[in-house]
């Protein structure tokens, strides 16, 4: 999902050295930055979240806020500190003139400042309910009394918690942080105010139409009667949850965020902190028929982001818009005509649509999974959600062409049994942001903190790329892809796996410059090959070279073009075994695939040879896909021959551990 190069507007205000000395300049070499929502109508100028550096204490936050007020007052400006953050992020929320931004950015401890902006409920039409008969289907979904060990926090509108469908299941907290409703003639009708939240609470844990019928919920009001909230209100809500968790630690927590606003660095940062405190966050991808990476919290990598599909597993269309898509979406779930509790009466039901409803489904599934296995980490839960999803059922033609390869073709489903998946080696594919077209542009894909990067590949629609490599960054391996001159940009594709007690390293062989090609193998005792990458400095690898096929009996070896450096990902983990599987096609073909068989998991996907007519390689579920340029442009010579190379692994250790438990 979205990393630090998100598509938001960043204004770095230049610091004037001749400032009148009222503000202490930040430490040498650092400049605080200003961010605001890229979507102008959603901006809320006049209210700002001042985010302080990570290690700032509450007392320092309060002192910095007071200093800002004092300095503003000296200049004749009134300011109001609305909230001092601590527990999740250090900082404060301030109401002030935009004229003071330059001053505020120079305060000590300031990391960045973000202008407040709006967030919105993601159901359509969330307040134009079509009441359906309360009894709506005979063959009711009746899972076990699932989710009973889990608490689900809902950040939404107010809710009618005594509705028969959810009575006793939802505790309405006293948290409320909502903006005034728009319009002078707005009539605050209770049932409309409660509509969105009541429906979602019903989808998560309703007795009749709920996914996790045993889950208990807590609601926080961050959306007003028009389904509108603010980034700052949502932040304060997330902080409230963190403080509640610290005061009274309970079992697993799921936080449902059925809302979306423009890309927000601060909202994503707060989600990251909460996720790293062991909380599972599930959010709506957004209903804008757009790239989910342009929205928050959908773009936060630590959040499980959910798009919406209908009963036919097609992406949901909502008026002229529809579900968001792209690499920031983790999976899809039902989100069209979803029946749930209606706040129009205490026994009414209604159908609503949107990515909010889809996210509520996944929050319910997550609650069921966590209730069955309370020790699951966020990474383990996400991998299981992906693993148990229905694969390749969505018609990708609905998505823009450039987004199809990036969008996961996964529809959430409950596991056939909530126990017993422990033996599986789970892997997922993580796409980077697009590098951009400049000659030296690179793209980086990262795995979650408790996942292992087992392989790295790259993809470019133009075919102009210089391959990819795994490199260490902040003590973790990342996957970096390199653009080439004249290229329109590249993607890095990481294969991220759950491999307990793994010790992985990268072995590199420089370009061989010999006719045999470049080779590298895993030479350490007990290390197995999980992935191969190749990277080259030349603009164009010669296409006249024949494919270099792997010598038999050397499974722990990566081979590649003689002008490329080759990188082998070598891992040692208890019981880990891997094998190489190849599928070569002598005639040119736009796509070559090779899949791992049942019981094996795809960890590595690469192409032979790495010549320029190969657009790249990437993993889709358990299949390695190698894409080449349009056949019509390559001709049908041997140049067009491509081999897809899959590395398939399994863990005997995980299998044994699982058998011992059963």
């Amino acid at each position: 999902q979205e990393d630090e190069d998100g598509d938001y507007e960043e204004l770095v205000l230049a610091l004037r050295s001749e400032e009148d000395g009222l503000a202490e300049a930040p430490e040498h070499g650092t400049t605080a930055t200003f961010h605001r929502c890229a979507k102008d109508p959603w901006r809320l100028p006049g209210t700002y979240v001042v985010v302080l550096k990570e290690e700032t204490h509450l007392s320092q936050s309060e002192r910095t806020a007071r200093r800002l007020q004092a300095q503003a007052a000296r200049r004749g400006y009134l300011t109001k500190i609305l909230h001092v953050f601590h527990g999740l992020l250090p900082g404060f929320l301030v109401k002030m003139s935009g004229d003071l931004l330059e001053l505020a950015l120079k305060l000590p401890h300031v990391d960045y400042i973000e202008e407040d902006s709006s967030v919105f409920a993601q159901s359509i039409p969330w307040n134009l309910e079509r009441i359906t008969p309360p009894r709506y289907r005979a063959d009711e979904y009746q899972p076990p009394d699932g989710g009973s060990l889990v608490e689900v926090y809902l950040l939404d509108t107010s809710i009618q918690s005594d509705h028969r469908e959810i009575e006793g299941r939802v505790m309405v907290t006293d948290f409320e942080n909502v903006p005034e409703e728009d319009g002078t003639r707005f009539h605050r009708q209770a049932s409309k105010c409660d509509s969105h939240g009541t429906h979602l609470a019903g989808v998560v844990s309703g007795r009749d139409a709920g996914v996790a019928k045993g889950a208990s919920m807590r609601s926080l009001r961050v959306l007003n009667c028009q389904g509108k909230g603010t980034v700052s209100g949502t932040l304060i809500g997330l902080e409230f949850i963190r403080k509640s968790q610290l005061v009274q630690p309970v079992g697993p927590l799921v936080v449902l965020l059925p809302l979306a606003g423009g890309y927000s660095r601060v909202l994503n940062a707060a989600c990251q902190r909460l996720a790293r405190a062991g909380v599972v966050l599930v959010t709506a991808a957004g209903n804008f028929r757009d790239d989910a990476c342009l929205y928050s919290p959908a773009s936060a990598p630590e959040v499980i982001t959910v798009g919406a599909t209908n009963a036919q597993d097609q992406p949901v269309t909502l008026g002229t818009l529809g579900t968001n898509f792209g690499r920031c979406v983790d999976l899809f779930a039902p989100g069209e005509d979803i029946i749930g509790a209606s706040s129009d009466c205490s026994t009414c039901f209604v159908s609503q649509s949107g990515t909010s409803q889809a996210a509520a489904h996944v929050a319910g599934i997550a609650a069921m999974m966590l209730s069955a296995e309370p020790e699951l980490t966020l990474a383990e839960l996400r991998q299981r959600l992906i693993h148990f999803s229905a694969k390749d059922v969505i018609n990708e033609a609905w998505f823009p062409e450039d987004q199809r390869v990036l969008t996961p073709n996964l529809v959430a489903a409950l596991p056939p049994s909530t126990h017993g998946a422990g033996w599986q080696l789970f892997c997922r594919t993580v796409w980077s942001a697009h590098s951009g077209p400049t000659r030296m542009a690179t793209a980086v894909a990262r795995c979650a903190p408790d996942e292992e990067l087992l392989s790295c590949s790259s993809f470019s629609r133009s075919g102009k790329r210089r391959g990819e490599r795994m490199e260490a960054q902040g003590g973790k391996l990342v996957c970096r892809a390199h653009n080439a001159f004249g290229g329109e940009g590249v993607y890095a594709i990481a294969r991220c796996c759950l491999l307990p007690q793994a010790n992985c390293s990268v072995h590199t062989a420089p370009p061989a410059e010999a006719s045999m090609g470049t080779r590298v193998h895993c030479h350490q005792q007990g290390h197995v090959l999980t992935g191969c990458s190749s990277h080259w400095e030349v603009e164009d690898l010669g296409t006249h070279k024949p494919p270099v096929l792997r010598p038999r009996g050397q499974p722990n070896q990566c081979v590649g073009h003689r002008e490329a450096s080759i990188h082998a990902s070598c891992c040692h983990a208890p019981g880990l075994e891997c094998k190489v599987k190849e599928h070569g096609i002598p005639a040119p073909q736009e796509q070559v695939t090779v899949a791992c068989e049942e019981g094996w998991t795809l960890t590595g996907c690469s192409a032979l040879p790495g010549t320029s007519h190969v657009l790249g390689a990437y993993a889709v579920d358990n299949t390695c896909v190698v894409r080449s340029r349009d056949v019509s442009t390559t001709g049908s010579t041997s140049e067009g021959a491509v081999t897809a190379v899959a590395i398939c692994c399994r863990s005997r250790h995980l299998a044994q551990a699982s058998q011992e438990l059963q």
Epitope: P134, D145, S161, D162, G168
Partner: antibody
């Protein structure tokens, strides 16, 4: 602890009105409404209706035919059931219970309608 | 309205006996069924909710089963304090309705 405490017994003349109260404590009021159920001597249980502590919303049994009104006062955590134009067949024990699922019951209030 | 029919309307049993009471709904109510115990002069007490889930504090000798239209309350080994009247209640639809009751008496 979670409990519903009802007002004391009432003796009323036909045509009069009665108002029974039910004070809730020990749980989150807004998470449940209050159901009212009556039981005539030697008879079974009959649901009269439901009222919300959250927003005052009501749901009445048809049989009440506009004779009954259910209200709540969240400030005192109390629910009320008023029955007008009393008849002798309204003689019963009136119970309040928590929610539609009726997980907790009040001790009951005996209402006798007699001339 | 959904009709709830309980059977038998009364039964005589001895301490230690296994007792079964049935409740039939006039239409499908999924699992929206509760069972109550009422002793003379007392308010009903919830025993089983959602057709089969035991309310906290209720002895394990009480169990409920069924889904759709047919439901059963079973007392595996009748105890002296179990002699009372038992009611089923559906809350699948409003008005919520009760069975006419089953009186369990000492043989």
């Amino acid at each position: 602890q979670v409990q519903l405490v009802q007002s004391g017994a009432e003796v009323k003349k036909p045509g009069a009105s009665v108002k029974v109260s039910c004070k809730a404590s020990g749980y989150s009021l807004t998470s449940y409404g209050i159901s009212w159920v009556r039981q005539a001597p030697g008879q079974g249980l009959e649901w009269m209706g439901w009222v919300s502590f959250y927003n005052g919303q009501t749901n009445y049994a048809q049989k009440l035919q506009g004779r009954g009104t259910m209200t709540t006062d969240p400030s005192t955590s109390t629910a009320y059931m008023e029955l007008r134009s009393l008849r002798s067949d309204d003689t019963a024990v009136y119970y309040c219970a928590r929610g539609y699922g009726m997980s907790i019951w009040g001790q009951g209030t005996t209402v006798t309608v007699s001339s | 309205d959904i009709q709830m029919t309980q059977s038998p309307s009364s039964l005589s049993a001895s301490v230690g006996d296994r007792v079964t009471i049935t409740c039939r709904a006039s239409q499908n109510i999924n699992s929206w069924l509760n069972w109550y115990q009422q002793k003379p002069g007392k308010a009903p007490k919830l025993l089983i909710y959602g057709a089969s889930s035991r309310q906290s504090g209720v002895p394990s000798r009480f169990s409920g089963s069924g889904s759709g239209t047919d439901f059963t309350l079973t007392i595996s080994s009748l105890q002296p304090e179990d002699f009372a009247t038992y009611y089923c209640q559906q809350w699948f639809d409003v008005p919520t309705t009760f069975g006419q009751g089953t009186k369990v008496e000492i043989k």
